[in-house]
């Protein structure tokens, strides 16, 4: 047979679906690997073939499309399960071919069990919403294409295990869930259960979104350096250990890159001959404000080290800050730090 362009196992698409629910899985070839769509390929005489490898097996086998009630079917570039079973877990391959051309890609499909409170090994999308912001809406995700627009499904929303009824600031509105002036107590897993009829059967789709309430953009600030500061003097004798914490507060800013670094006499620690250790720790507030601490330590400080200029720097998307540490030698009358 002719050579086939094998894109291998597309682990970027770790598809997870719930057991005993419908699942529609598009062939990734047309979404990520090829320049044309299924319709173009089909009209050019190319055929889409599906096969799979069961979990913990090496043998590729064709998918059985002759199961009772068409439990597994293919429609254009979509593989349908109505519904899934636990042993459908495995690596699935879609191959596009004719007599002169072949391209294929595999992807893992995991069928996941859930309990009555929707707890499972499923990875949920995270939706960040700003604290005290007016209204935030989340939409029941990944339900497009399961039923025609003429079908009006029933939708029930839950927070954790509790159906959302008479929640003071959370309002279910069909596929949408609205949050009014959200607070940190609104954090949690929100699940929509969509029920729709098809060919005399009722199917359920369960989708969960993790809501995380974060700091508001109106509260966003440049970094604030708590330490070092002008009130604390690091007074040491030669031979002692010098430990200076650089403690910086970063208000939450969506997609901000928060940085903290030290300079010694204007150079990065790696560029000086001093034997310096720097340890970093990070903690977060309930609204994901970040406190980043970088501890600079010199095991046995020399008189020269005590004359150096130690400056803590910080940066986020709102701006930069810097603060020099006041370092002096014990018993030495000079208290003035080197000027920047």
């Amino acid at each position: 047979s002719e050579r086939c362009d094998d894109w291998g196992l597309d682990t970027m698409r770790q598809i997870q679906v719930f057991e005993d629910e419908p699942a529609r899985i598009k062939c990734p070839l047309f979404e990520h690997f090829l320049k044309y769509n299924y319709s173009t390929a089909h009209s050019s005489g190319l055929t889409l073939i599906w096969y799979w490898t069961r979990q913990d097996r090496d043998l590729e086998e064709p998918i059985n499309f002759r199961l009772p009630e068409n439990r597994i079917s293919k429609e254009k570039d979509v593989l349908w399960f109505r519904p899934t079973l636990l042993n459908d877990t495995g690596n699935y391959t879609c191959m596009l071919r004719n007599t002169t051309y072949c391209s294929k890609v595999a992807f893992p499909l995991e069928v996941v069990q859930k309990d009555s409170c929707f707890n499972s090994a499923m990875r949920f999308p995270v939706h960040k919403m700003y604290i005290e912001h007016g209204i935030h809406k989340i939409t029941c995700p990944n339900v497009d294409g399961y039923f025609p627009s003429s079908v009006k499904p029933s939708v029930t929303w839950y927070k954790g295990c509790t159906e959302i009824v008479d929640f003071h600031n959370v309002l279910p509105e069909g596929m949408n869930l609205s949050f009014f002036i959200p607070l940190v107590s609104n954090n949690g897993n929100y699940t929509c259960v969509v029920t729709y009829p098809e060919n005399g059967r009722l199917f359920h789709l369960t989708r969960t979104v993790t809501v995380k309430v974060v700091g508001s953009p109106k509260d966003a600030l440049p970094p604030q350096i708590y330490s070092p500061n002008d009130r604390v003097v690091y007074e040491k004798e030669p031979g002692e250990e010098l430990v200076i914490p650089c403690k910086v507060y970063f208000s939450f800013i969506m997609d901000s890159h928060n940085e903290v670094w030290w300079t010694i006499d204007g150079k990065k620690p790696d560029d000086v001959t001093v034997d310096i250790t720097i340890n970093e720790s990070v903690s977060y507030s309930s609204t994901e404000d970040e406190t980043r601490t970088q501890i600079l330590s010199i095991k046995k400080v020399t008189p020269e080290d005590l004359r150096r200029n130690y400056v803590c720097h910080a940066r986020n998307t709102k701006g930069e800050a810097e603060q020099a540490a006041k370092v002096k030698q014990k018993g030495n009358g000079c208290t003035e730090p080197m000027t920047l």
């Epitope: 007016g134 003071h168 009014f180 107590s185 109106k218 509260d219």
Partner: antibody
């Protein structure tokens, strides 16, 4: 200095309407959520309504839902409470208060008295 | 909604003595609890937020403690200006709710 000054209170008959205003100064009004809190004569404090800093989100106590409407005009630094279908049990001093999730109601106005009586 | 219960309803204390006021929430409010002081004819004034942080300008004799469902406001040495009604309030969940108040009166 943060200042909140309520106005618009008075005597009104049951079923009547009243509009309260709260003029804010001394802070960036558009950065803060605002609330109305009331206190019936000789009673405790009761939260009535809240509005988000951007004016989009509003919340109400069950006792006033459907009758009261909170709004704000950030260009005028003013908070409003439109009270319709007033009842005798709405008689109270109405306070406007600034709120933050981090600090609760950190500043209050001096209050305006609403009396609902025939 | 979360019900806040304060005790005692009235507390009779002599000036210079310590006063301890309690507040219980019907479910956990984390540390999202505030204390207010109200004198006759005046608006409430924020004393404590975050269960234990003193608001700006509040004297050190006022302190708050607790988390979850049990909270305490302590006035270490009552001054004449401290005789008033004190309210606790949770701001963890909407609707934000107040306790019924504790009146601190001169013994």
């Amino acid at each position: 200095e943060v200042q909140l000054l309520e106005s618009g209170g008075g005597l009104v008959q049951p079923g009547g309407s009243l509009r309260l205003s709260c003029a804010a100064s001394g802070f960036i009004f558009s950065h803060y959520g605002m609330s109305w809190v009331r206190q019936a004569p000789g009673k405790g404090l009761e939260w009535v309504s809240a509005i988000s800093y951007d004016g989009e989100g509003t919340l109400y106590a069950d006792s006033v839902k459907g009758r009261f409407t909170i709004s704000r005009d950030n260009s005028k630094n003013t908070l409003y409470l439109q009270m319709n279908s007033l009842r005798a049990e709405d008689t109270a001093v109405y306070y406007c208060a600034r709120f933050r999730y981090y600090t609760a109601f950190d500043y209050w106005g001096q209050g305006t008295l609403v009396t609902v009586s025939s | 909604e979360i019900v806040m219960t304060q005790s005692p309803a009235t507390l009779s204390v002599s000036p210079g003595e310590r006063a301890t006021l309690s507040c219980r929430a019907s479910q956990s409010v984390s540390s999202n609890l505030a204390w207010y002081q109200q004198k006759p004819g005046q608006a409430p004034r924020l004393l404590i937020y975050g269960a234990s942080t003193r608001a700006t300008g509040i004297p050190a004799r006022f302190s708050g403690s607790g988390s979850g469902t049990e909270f305490t406001l302590t006035i270490s040495s009552l001054q004449s200006e401290d005789f008033a009604v004190y309210y606790c309030q949770q701001y963890n969940n909407w609707p934000w709710t107040f306790g019924q108040g504790t009146k601190v009166e001169i013994k």
